[in-house]
Amino acid sequence: RPSPTLPEQDALPSSEDDDDDDDSSSEEKETDNTKPNPVAPYWTSPEKMEKKLHAVPAAKTVKFKCPSSGTPNPTLRWLKNGKEFKPDHRIGGYKVRYATWSIIMDSVVPSDKGNYTCIVENEYGSINHTYQLDVVERSPHRPILQAGLPANKTVALGSNVEFMCKVYSDPQPHIQWLKHIEVNGSKIGPDNLPYVQILKHSGINSSDAEVLTLFNVTEAQSGEYVCKVSNYIGEANQSAWLTVTRPALEERPAVMTSPLYLEHHHHHH
């Protein structure tokens, strides 16, 4: 650890803390010798778990919380990148505070980057939640996008669709939503770059560039949608597929093409 004046981390997670925590659950008191009704685990404060992407400067402390309850009291364990996470997997270990359903990692370093999953379970059920940790330089850095967004969507013809792209960037990023298209039957232009259509971009006319909304979708709008984010340091992009299905025996609607700007665009997958 960086501080010789502070004790080494406990080798094993410890619940020996005096937290009087609103979030902690205690087993229901039994009355008349009857067993309490079984309850599968559930989140007690899901609103505190909404921030999934945590971009943290090196050396800082990270605290992930999964406040839960259930009957009997659920157990809590943590995975890193889908595998069992043991204290000796990182220098300085980590602390699990069972009273507050939290894991604490001090003095983070780049090797701490990854996905951290809490698993809360009892004999009646299991729930899990994943946080994404990125350890960043405070100085300007490339944009970082939350994993899993935008998400693939399958919707019925005529529905409205919303794609979301969560961005962490310093300096201010430029966000573009692109769709891969065909021009004269070809997806690739003469310059060997894919054809894309710019659907939306951050700027004066975009109220919320992190969200792309498509109204009354047609089959022609099926395909790959790309969230491309750039700043002067670099760029990042992630894509999702839209599948538009239509009921059988229904006449195919006329395809409306919007007069949006076409361009050649180099896109890294």
């Epitope: 979030d23 402390t61 100085s139």
Partner: antibody, heavy 116, light 109 residues
Framework: QVQLQESGPGLVKPSGTLSLTCAVS?????????WSWVRQPPGKGLEWIGE???????SYNPSLKSRVTISVDKSKNQFSLKLSSVTAADTAVYYC?????????WGQGTLVTVSS | SYVLTQPPSVSVAPGQTARITCGGN??????VHWYQQKPGQAPVLVVY???DRPSGIPERFSGSNSGNTATLTISRVEAGDEADYYC???????????FGGGTKLTVLG
């Protein structure tokens, strides 16, 4: 045992620039820590000024950001604070400190008075 | 920016328990650290990461953090505990460090 020692003028004229240096001994400034400045006006509370990582990455208190510069000199194992356009309100004890998420080592502090 | 609110003063008789609070929006999601400062001296870390003690700090000092309030508890208070106490967090949203306004602990008698 890491030790920090502030040095610099104890008196600065209004509109001038306050300059302080913090010498780090017993440990490397290139460790996984942030090197911070905190001040305390007479009879008042602690105020975080800003900090620097050995890579040169910095973060500043928004209320002071336009006037503050923190720099690091790895060859001398020290870091420095410059605060421009000072007024009497900048009179305070200035501490340098080592930090991760918390401050685990502090200098003893140096009183800087802004007066003509 | 993030604000931490502490009571300006707390008084307690020797041998009793002192509780100093630190309020902040959803502070339970942050890691809270506590410092003791005696007149003319630099602050000293007494609790970090909500409830951990650095070596050399008596077990009488403990901490908790939940919801919108963190608490520093000093049991069996002694005259030597009289000092100013500050809470501090690194606000992960703004990426800035923040101190509470400080609480003066007075030991009566």
């Amino acid at each position: 045992q890491v030790q920090l020692q502030e040095s610099g003028p104890g008196l600065v004229k209004p509109s001038g620039t306050l300059s302080l240096t913090c010498a780090v001994s017993g440990g490397s400034i290139s460790s996984n820590n942030w090197w911070s400045w905190v001040r305390q006006p007479p009879g008042k509370g602690l105020e975080w000024i800003g900090e620097i990582y050995h890579s040169g990455s910095t973060s500043y208190n928004p209320s002071l950001k336009s006037r503050v510069t923190i720099s690091v000199d790895k060859s001398k194992n020290q870091f420095s604070l410059k605060l421009s356009s000072v007024t009497a309100a900048d009179t305070a004890v200035y501490y340098c400190a080592r930090a991760t998420d918390w401050f685990d080592h502090w200098g003893q502090g140096t009183l800087v008075t802004v007066s003509s | 920016s993030y604000v931490l609110t502490q009571p300006p003063s707390v008084s307690v008789a020797p041998g009793q328990t002192a509780r100093i609070t630190c309020g902040g929006n959803n502070i339970g999601s942050e890691s809270v650290h506590w410092y003791q400062q005696k007149p003319g001296q630099a602050p000293v870390l007494v609790v970090y990461d909500d409830s951990d003690r650095p070596s050399g700090i008596p077990e009488r000092f403990s901490g908790s953090n939940s919801g919108n309030t963190a608490t520093l508890t000093i049991s069996r208070v002694e005259a030597g505990d009289e000092a100013d106490y500050y809470c501090q967090v690194w606000d992960s949203t703004s990426d800035h460090r923040v101190f509470g306004g400080g609480t003066k602990l007075t030991v009566l008698g």
